[in-house]
Interface confidence: low
């Protein structure tokens, strides 16, 4: 049976298509091609006489058609108007005609799409944004990508029926994209350039760094303020309610106690008009602020009465503090056998007596705060029980502690003498 096949079936506009003929009968006078699904003289494209090998253009010939001796028809530089059915009529020697119909589809060459937005500067949590893939083309599929991935399932994302418009119902700062759209037909896909949304947001509550609130006189105070915002926030600094400067960084050299106060950072978004503030209390003092819990170290915790001595050391990392000692809720020293040294850091008992047995603790303090160590138990006996040595009995190991504490001792003594 006579058949015809389009090579290819889907053709890009401007390309060519070949209508191939299969099972062509023998003993032919000739054949003709027609546009459409039936033989119509007004729509004849070309006729071919085998005897003369002569091709004759018909009324529907556009000059782009070529007929071959095997009856195949080549159409070059196809347009969308060429889409449709084509009928081949074969005239046999017995004057009985055979017909076969084929078809092909011409798709336009896709233009590069682009994205338009109905809102170039959407405001976070307030605005919706409709992104439209341009241009509008019939018989075309529209595709979308965000962050180089297909669209996530989200109640805030809506696609129009034709997929050409993507609506973000309530934008957030995370919705900036990039967004890309594509147009697709049976032949190709073309991508738009990526589009980034300029989502206006903030400012969020500003953060002041560093987090310190206490400073010593004489140092430089450098504070930085940051608030998430688009466009970037404009910053102002106020001290005790008075505007100091309109910068993100605040710098004051060689501060004194007079620089203590309430430091306010104000962040302003010029696009939305919104502003947020954060307040920080800065204290400038030679005194340490919150005092850390001290620790007691003992040269030994079990001693022989009237024979051994013991050294108790109050360890602290704080500076500018004072130290005092307690035994059975009594302030020390309480006897001549007890000596305080190194700015009260070390309590020495020599020799230890039976009445010295019990709990000891130290307290570090300044005018702002104080903190106590955990108590330590000193055991005094008069028999030959083994001794629990933490440091050599002769106390030589104390040199290590004293060396480590030397800086603190100097500061502690200086402040101790200064304040008392």
């Amino acid at each position: 049976q006579l058949t015809t096949e389009s090579m290819p079936f889907n053709v890009a506009e401007g390309k060519e298509v070949l209508l191939l003929v299969h099972n062509l009968p023998q003993q032919l006078f000739g054949y003709s091609w027609y546009k459409g699904e039936r033989v119509d003289g007004n729509r004849q494209i070309v006729g071919y006489a085998i005897g003369t090998q002569q091709a004759t253009p018909g009324p529907a010939n556009s000059g782009r058609e070529t007929i071959y001796p095997n009856a195949s028809l080549l159409i070059q530089n196809v347009t969308q108007n060429d889409t449709g059915f084509y009928t081949l009529q074969v005239i046999k020697s017995d004057l009985v005609n055979e017909e076969a119909t084929g078809q092909f589809h011409v798709y336009p060459e896709l233009p590069k799409p682009f994205i338009t937005s109905n809102n170039s500067n959407p405001v976070e949590d307030e605005d919706a944004v409709a992104l439209t893939c341009e241009p509008e083309i019939q018989n075309t599929t529209y595709l979308w990508w965000v962050n180089n991935q297909s669209l996530p399932v989200s109640p805030r994302l809506q696609l129009s029926n034709d997929n050409r418009t993507l609506t973000l119902l309530s934008v957030t700062r995370n919705d900036v994209g990039p967004y890309e759209c594509g147009i697709q037909n049976k032949l190709s896909v073309d991508h738009s350039d990526p589009v980034i949304l300029n989502v206006l947001y903030g400012p969020d509550d500003p953060t002041i760094s560093p987090s310190y609130t206490y400073y010593r006189p004489g140092v430089n105070l450098s504070l930085s303020c940051h608030a998430a915002s688009n466009p970037p926030a404009q910053y102002s600094w106020l001290i005790d309610g008075n505007i100091q400067q309109h910068t993100q960084e605040l710098f004051i050299s060689n501060i004194t106690e007079k620089n203590s106060g309430l430091y306010t950072c104000q962040a302003n978004n010029s696009a939305s008009g919104h502003s947020r503030t954060t307040v920080k209390t800065i204290t400038v003092s030679a005194l340490s602020p919150v005092v850390a819990k001290p620790q007691i170290k003992a040269s030994k915790t079990t001693v022989t009465g009237d024979k051994d001595s013991v050294n108790l050391t109050c360890s602290t990392n704080d500076t500018g503090i004072s130290i005092r000692w307690f035994f059975k809720n009594q302030s020390l020293p309480s006897s001549e056998r007890m000596k305080l040294s190194q700015g009260n850091i070390t309590l020495s008992i020599n020799p230890v007596k039976r009445e010295d047995a019990g709990t000891y603790w130290c307290e570090v303090f300044n005018p702002i705060s104080k903190n106590q160590s955990d108590p330590i138990m000193l055991n005094v006996n008069y028999n030959a029980l083994p001794q629990e040595n933490l440091i050599n009995v002769d106390g030589s190991g104390l040199n290590d502690i004293f060396e480590a504490q030397k800086i603190e001792w100097h500061e502690a003594r200086a402040h101790h003498h200064h304040h008392h």
Partner: antibody, heavy 121, light 106 residues
């Protein structure tokens, strides 16, 4: 059918003021950016500014040549766009067009017929 | 700011001829638009995004180009095609127009 119809043009002295109107019909007025474009006699086209749509909270932007002197506004109840022109100069003499904008890419798909402003003493 | 330069300033041709109008950008751009204006009339949107014909524009018009060089082509001029053609680009917040090409009958 989309229609834009300008009015309010006329003769004004240098330093004077004038308000142009543009009546819009055939589309949802609040959904579109609207622009003003002018054309001096025998010259090319000059964009003056836009006012955003409802989603954009009717944000305005102006060209450097008119910023501070011209103000664009819109009355959504009347579907009307306005151009308030103050401190007019001789070089502001032109035909003024209002245009509808497809989106952020400033493709002016519809134009009004224009209204003529002459600044002269 | 990107400057658009159109050439030639005036193009004199006869009906049936092919017309090629050029628009050159001072630096690379993605798309441009074209508008047609006839004497005493407002401009009309003609081609948008470089190559897309606006609604109702005849197929003898085409647009092409990329980067800095863009072209509006009329394959066979009809009497109604004689007019001034403007190209237009946009930057982040403001559009700019070329100075126009006047297409006149020879």
């Amino acid at each position: 059918e989309v229609q834009l119809l300008e009015s309010g043009g006329g003769l004004v002295q240098p330093g004077g003021s004038l308000r142009l109107s543009c009546a819009a019909s055939g589309f949802t007025f609040t959904d579109y950016y609207m622009n003003w474009v002018r054309q001096a006699p025998g010259k090319g086209l000059e964009w003056l500014g836009f006012i955003g749509n409802k989603a954009n909270a009717y944000t305005t932007e102006y060209s450097a040549s008119v910023k501070g002197r011209f103000t664009i506004s819109r009355d959504k109840s009347k579907n009307t766009l306005y151009l308030q022109m103050n401190s007019l100069r001789a070089e502001d003499t032109a035909t003024y067009y209002c245009t509808r904008d497809r989106g952020i890419r400033f493709q002016f798909d519809y134009w009004g017929q224009g209204t003529t402003v002459t600044v002269s003493s | 700011e990107i400057v658009l330069t159109q050439s030639p300033a005036t193009l004199s041709l006869s009906p049936g001829e092919r017309a090629t109008l050029s628009c050159r950008a001072s630096s690379s751009v993605t798309y441009i638009h074209w508008y047609q204006q006839k004497p005493g009339q407002a401009p009309r949107s003609w081609i948008y995004a470089t190559s897309n014909l606006a609604s109702g524009i005849p197929a003898r018009f085409s647009g092409s180009g990329s980067g800095t060089d863009f072209t509006l082509t009329i394959s066979s001029l009809e009497p109604e095609d004689f007019a001034v053609y403007y190209c237009q680009h946009w930057s982040s917040k403001s559009p700019t127009f070329g100075q126009g090409t006047k297409l006149e009958i020879k």
